[in-house]
């Protein structure tokens, strides 16, 4: 991780991808510590603030503008050397987002995947982006970059993620950049939550008053397990939405969530999953599917759940 003997290591917190108007802390780690350092920008644009200045431990940059985008290096203080400074650090690329219209991000075959599978994240736009970048929330490493392919007035790139492990679950966003401004990125795509299932034992799913109900009768689906899940997720086959509820410890030492579905109008096949607060995007095996049948005259589809769809929000904590 650290540089060579006389080479400092330059890093960015929380990320090298910074929204326009945001702040980022640059740290120059030299000789097992954070000492005084100087900062350089390779293209020499936007350097007045660095001119002849020495920074202590970290440099807080911001609010950032497109001019901040580019490659940075630092030199650590080395008082007894000829120049007084170390060799230049590794190059650190700072990317500034919010400079073009956002692209779209899709998951194939979908955002809910089993451990070990591979997912293709496709980033596309009608803006002719030269490069696309894929970034996972909370990761300080540089985003993945691919050259955009242009077909029929659309530029796109396919990022292959896998085989999926818990560490790859999370919230993804993609960005585009145009020629000649490679580090001035677009606004982020809408967030896409990649959820990995199959890591823990399956919960059980049951219906009250039962899986076959009269039209208009109130139905509640209960998801429970002996495992101390923090959150349960309920999905309905053919629907992009999932509902989630906090698990409640019961007297019989199970952990349960009761999903009120309201008056029955339409049947469907349901599954539930459990997850832990620390890893909100890593879910259990699916419960056995539960077919809810409605007898009588179904007038319309079941009311749409109001919880966030699987496109975003799953990987945020449920407060």
């Amino acid at each position: 991780l650290m540089g060579g003997q006389d080479k400092p290591f330059l890093s960015a917190r929380p990320s090298t991808v910074v929204p326009r108007g945001g702040h980022v802390a640059l740290q120059c780690h030299y000789r097992r510590g954070f000492n005084n350092f100087m900062l350089y920008k390779e293209d020499r644009s936007h350097v007045p603030i660095f001119h002849g200045r020495i920074f202590q431990e970290s440099f807080i940059m911001g609010p950032v503008t497109p001019a901040h985008a580019g490659t940075y290096r630092c030199r650590g203080s080395r008082p007894h050397s000829l120049t007084g400074w170390s060799a230049p650090s590794n190059p650190l690329v700072i990317m500034v987002t919010g400079n073009h219209r956002k692209p779209s991000l899709l998951a194939h075959p979908g955002p809910l995947l089993k451990s070990g599978e591979t997912v293709i994240l496709q980033c596309w736009s009608d803006v002719m982006f030269e490069h696309f970048f894929l970034h996972r929330e909370g990761i300080s490493e540089d985003p993945s970059r691919l050259v955009g392919q242009i077909h029929d007035g659309v530029s796109k790139a396919n990022f292959s993620i896998g085989p999926l492990m818990p560490v790859l679950a999370g919230t993804y966003r993609c960005y585009g950049s145009v020629p000649h401004s490679p580090y001035q990125l677009s606004a982020p795509s809408d967030p896409l939550d990649i959820v990995i299932t199959g890591l823990y034992e399956k919960p059980s799913l049951s219906a009250q008053p039962g899986p076959t109900v009269q039209a208009g009768e109130n139905v509640t689906l209960s998801c429970s397990s002996w495992s101390s899940y923090d959150i349960y997720h309920l999905s309905r086959e053919g629907e992009a939405h999932e509902r989630r509820l906090r698990a409640v410890p019961k007297v019989n030492r199970t952990f349960q969530a009761d999903f009120p579905l309201g008056p029955a109008t339409h049947g469907g096949t349901y599954r539930c999953f459990g997850s832990f607060r620390a890893l909100p995007c890593v879910w259990s095996n699916s419960s056995d599917p539960l077919l809810v049948s409605v007898t009588g005259n179904p007038s319309s589809s079941w009311p749409s759940p109001t919880e966030p769809s699987s496109k975003s929000g799953i990987c945020r904590h449920l407060h």
Epitope: R13, P14, G21, G22, H23, V24, A25, Q27, F34, P48, I49, H51, R53, F55, Q56, E57, S58, F59, I60, M61, G62, P63, T65, A67
Partner: antibody, heavy 118, light 107 residues
């Protein structure tokens, strides 16, 4: 949204100390710094200094070295300004503002009035 | 310390007028100039930084220009809600320093 909320007004006697707090929300506290600025009654803005919320390193303007001390409690996203041996000329509104090494202060607290009077 | 000399200290304009406030630095500040608006009883609000970059949510009637030692804030069509004191600030080198302020009033 980004917000900085400061503690309430203070009335102090000369020689006393005061500690002004500034609680930040809506952003990652340790990726920016906190600048402190004061405004005497009917006067302009005067920079006191700033603290790097990432490293905890403070920097003070020359006129404010000694009696003015910045501190942080990152666990509650709060910055503090402590002034000791208060003088009548310290009477002012004290502002915290988010900002880093580049000196741009993009979000400000509502201000804390410190009155020093015997 | 870099001294920022702001002028005028007071100006009165009619709604719709173009208003210009200038700031002169005692040395070259390499476009590291910000502008703030302060309404009575409120904290300052950032309008412009790095000479011409508008802060989030600032109406586009506010613009900044300049280089070297001379900088300008322009309100292209002043509105009643623009009544305030405007300050320039150099963010080139510490200590950051502010101009003395320009009070803008509507006739």
């Amino acid at each position: 949204q980004i917000q900085l909320v400061q503690s309430g007004s203070e009335l102090k006697k000369p020689g006393a100390s005061v500690k002004v707090s500034c609680k930040a929300s809506g952003y990652t506290f340790t990726t920016a710094g906190m600048q402190w600025v004061r405004q005497a009654p009917g006067q302009g803005l005067e920079w006191i200094g700033w603290i790097n919320s990432h490293s905890g390193v403070p920097k003070y303007a020359e006129d404010f070295k000694g009696r003015f001390v910045f501190s942080l409690d990152t666990s509650v996203s709060t910055a503090y300004l402590q002034i000791s041996s208060l003088k009548a000329e310290d009477t002012a509104v004290y502002f915290c503002a988010r900002g880093g090494d580049e000196g741009v202060m993009d979000y400000w607290g509502q201000g804390t009035t410190v009155t020093v009077s015997s | 310390d870099i001294v920022m000399t702001q002028s005028p200290s007071f100006l009165s304009a009619s709604v719709g007028d173009r208003v210009t406030i200038t700031c002169k630095a005692s040395q070259d500040v390499s476009t590291a100039v910000a502008w703030y608006q302060q309404k009575p009883g409120q904290p300052p609000k950032l309008l412009i930084y790095w000479t011409s970059t508008r802060h989030t949510g600032v109406p586009d009637r506010f613009s900044g220009s300049g280089s070297g030692t001379d900088y300008t804030l322009t309100i292209s069509s002043v509105q009643a809600e623009d009544v305030a004191v405007y300050y320039c600030q150099q963010h080139y080198s510490t200590p950051w320093t502010f101009g003395g302020g320009t009070k803008v009033e509507i006739k």
